[in-house]
């Protein structure tokens, strides 16, 4: 009985095809395989970012493969090709590992590359960025913004910076047809005559940097003796009522001073009879059935009433 | 429509240089190997040098080792071959072809240009 | 090297007829064979892979067979634009080679 084998796939190879770090894993199929005509072939491939402890294993028939990488570090991959037992009458069989690596030679020391990078999706709407230069670069040294992400077919560049000195410190994106819950792909590169500039790549989803405006017409009304019913609307833009999370901070007579989250656009707060006025404040976030993060918007303006007035045009 | 348009064939002195370029389109270039393969005037057809889809293996034929050096450009969607110490054996009709690949089997040809003319003559 | 060995430089036949063209490997390529047509004044194009599959929009009247060493392609039914030069080609391990051609011929 002759021992069956099969060979790894050939050319195995990491494919940069400039989207910042989304990348193709891409390989041919094994020497000899019209052996195994009748059979599907399969492939275990298994990658990481170098200096992850644990590897992404995916088993697919095909002879490609795609995701994001985190290009500030290099990438590496290895596949084989397994050999189902109704194959072979027996037991799995695999091939050696075939290998690939990839990473982007880095140019300039870590220092030069932008600092304290931050993204904030405006009201689900506007995209800005903001950084700040590398430590120790002079006034010469300029930063470009790049992005990708699925639905564009080529990586574009900022062309709306914000500049302070001559200098690009942040970049007003235009609007971004498709672009949330995927990743979003950004490389800051840089250039200066005196000395290279180390490039910064960064991977989020829209849906989880959404700062939105903080909500509208607040209103008060008293339900009943002790109970008052806080209200508000939603902020203006497209962000749907169902992905809205509220923090409201209620001052009773400046004193009380009570901070609740709930979820939708009212709230019903009990008193007692000692209260003469109450002011509340309140602010908007994308709840978690809509993002798995976000930020919290900018307070409302403060509203304040006194009881006293409330209770007459109740009974009014 | 799948389109391989080459250019740069010319005619050359022995000794002498040259690059050809191979414009792809219709097709996700950078998904496929490439390949040059020639036809000399006896009508014989002869594989120069393959590289494959993302450019980190290259394979070529005995009798241009050391002398032609194939490359793409997968922003560009262009193939290259740059031919040097040029001889007389390598007057032919250059043409970039794709590599075909299915779940068994690869190394063969499924898409041809129309081919540019290469003459080495003193 | 893999030579590939295509035995008749040319094949004389009428449309309609059924022809075979063989082509020998001189060592075991399994059916890694590939069959090209080179019509006058154009580039070759691909007919067969894997020693059986017709390329993409290939009429059936196109077929190939054969493992190891010995492969043969076969037009069932000729027709008047079938006038070409045919090639094997091995796909199995580099340097991918080709054999030195056929050439068919319409009385």
């Known amino acids: 009985d002759t021992e069956i084998k099969v060979n790894p796939p050939q050319d195995f190879e990491i494919v940069d095809p400039g989207y910042l770090g989304y990348l193709y894993l891409q390989w041919q199929p094994p020497l000899s395989l019209d052996n195994f005509k009748e059979c599907t072939v399969e492939y275990e491939l298994k990658y990481r970012n170098i200096g992850s402890e644990t590897w992404t294993t995916i088993i697919t028939k095909n002879l490609h493969y795609k995701d994001g990488f985190d290009l500030n570090k290099g990438i590496e991959a290895k596949i084989h090709t397994l050999l189902p037992w109704q194959c072979t009458n027996g037991s799995e069989v695999q091939s050696s590992w075939a290998e690939a690596t990839y990473w982007i030679s880095p140019q300039g020391i870590p220092e030069t590359k932008v600092q304290d990078m931050d993204c904030v999706y405006y009201n689900w709407q506007y995209l800005l960025c903001s950084w700040k230069p590398g430590i120790g670069v002079l006034l010469d040294t300029n930063y470009n913004l790049f992005y990708w992400y699925e639905g564009l077919d080529r990586a574009l560049q900022c062309v709306d910076y914000i500049k302070v000195d001559g200098q690009n410190i942040g970049c007003r994106f235009p609007y971004l047809e498709s672009s949330d819950y995927k990743d979003f792909y950004i490389c800051v590169n840089g250039s200066s005559e005196t000395k290279p500039i180390r490039s910064s790549y960064f991977t989020f989803q829209l849906q989880n940097i959404v700062k939105p405006l903080p909500p509208v017409c607040l209103t008060c009304t008293q339900e009943s003796l002790y109970e008052i019913k806080l209200k508000w609307s939603i902020p203006l833009g497209p962000i749907p009522a169902r992905c809205f999370v509220y923090e409201i901070e209620i001052r009773e007579d400046d004193t009380t001073l009570v901070t609740t989250t709930v979820e939708n656009e009212t709230y019903t707060l009990k008193i007692t009879n000692e209260t003469r006025q109450l002011c509340f404040v309140v602010r908007s976030k994308v709840n978690i059935y809509c993002s798995d993060d976000g930020i919290w918007s900018e307070w409302s303006d403060k509203q304040c009433w006194e009881v006293e007035e409330l209770l007459k045009k109740t009974l009014l | 429509e799948v389109q391989l348009v080459e250019s740069g064939g010319d005619l050359v002195r022995p000794g002498g240089s040259l690059q050809l370029s191979c414009a792809a389109s219709?097709?996700?270039?950078?998904?496929?190997?490439m390949s040059w393969v020639r036809q000399t005037p006896d009508r014989r057809l002869e594989w120069v040098a393959t590289v494959s889809s993302g450019g980190s293996y290259i394979y070529y034929a005995d009798s241009v080792k050391g002398r032609f050096t194939i490359s793409r450009d997968n922003a560009r969607n262009t193939l290259y071959l740059q031919m040097s110490s040029l001889k007389s054996e390598d007057t032919a009709m250059y043409y970039c072809?794709?590599?075909?690949?299915?779940?068994?089997?690869?190394?063969?040809?499924?898409?041809w240009g129309a081919g540019t003319t290469v003459t080495v003559s003193s | 090297d893999i030579v590939m060995t295509q035995s008749h430089k040319f094949i004389s036949t009428s449309v309609g007829d059924r022809v075979s063209i063989t082509c020998k490997a001189s060592?075991?390529?399994?059916?890694?064979v590939a069959w090209y047509q080179q019509i006058p004044g154009q580039s070759p194009k691909l007919l067969i892979y894997?020693?059986?599959y017709r390329s993409t929009g290939i009429p059936d009247r196109f077929t190939g067979s054969g493992s190891g060493t010995d492969f043969s392609f076969i037009i069932s039914s000729v027709q008047a634009e079938d006038l070409a030069l045919y090639y094997c080609q091995h796909h199995y391990s580099a340097p991918w080679t080709f054999g030195g051609g056929t050439t068919l011929d319409i009385k």
């Open positions: 060592q075991d390529v399994g059916t890694a």
């Open positions: 219709g097709f996700t270039f950078s998904r496929n190997g």
């Open positions: 072809a794709r590599q075909g690949t299915t779940a068994l089997a690869t190394r063969f040809f499924d898409v």
């Open positions: 894997s020693a059986s």
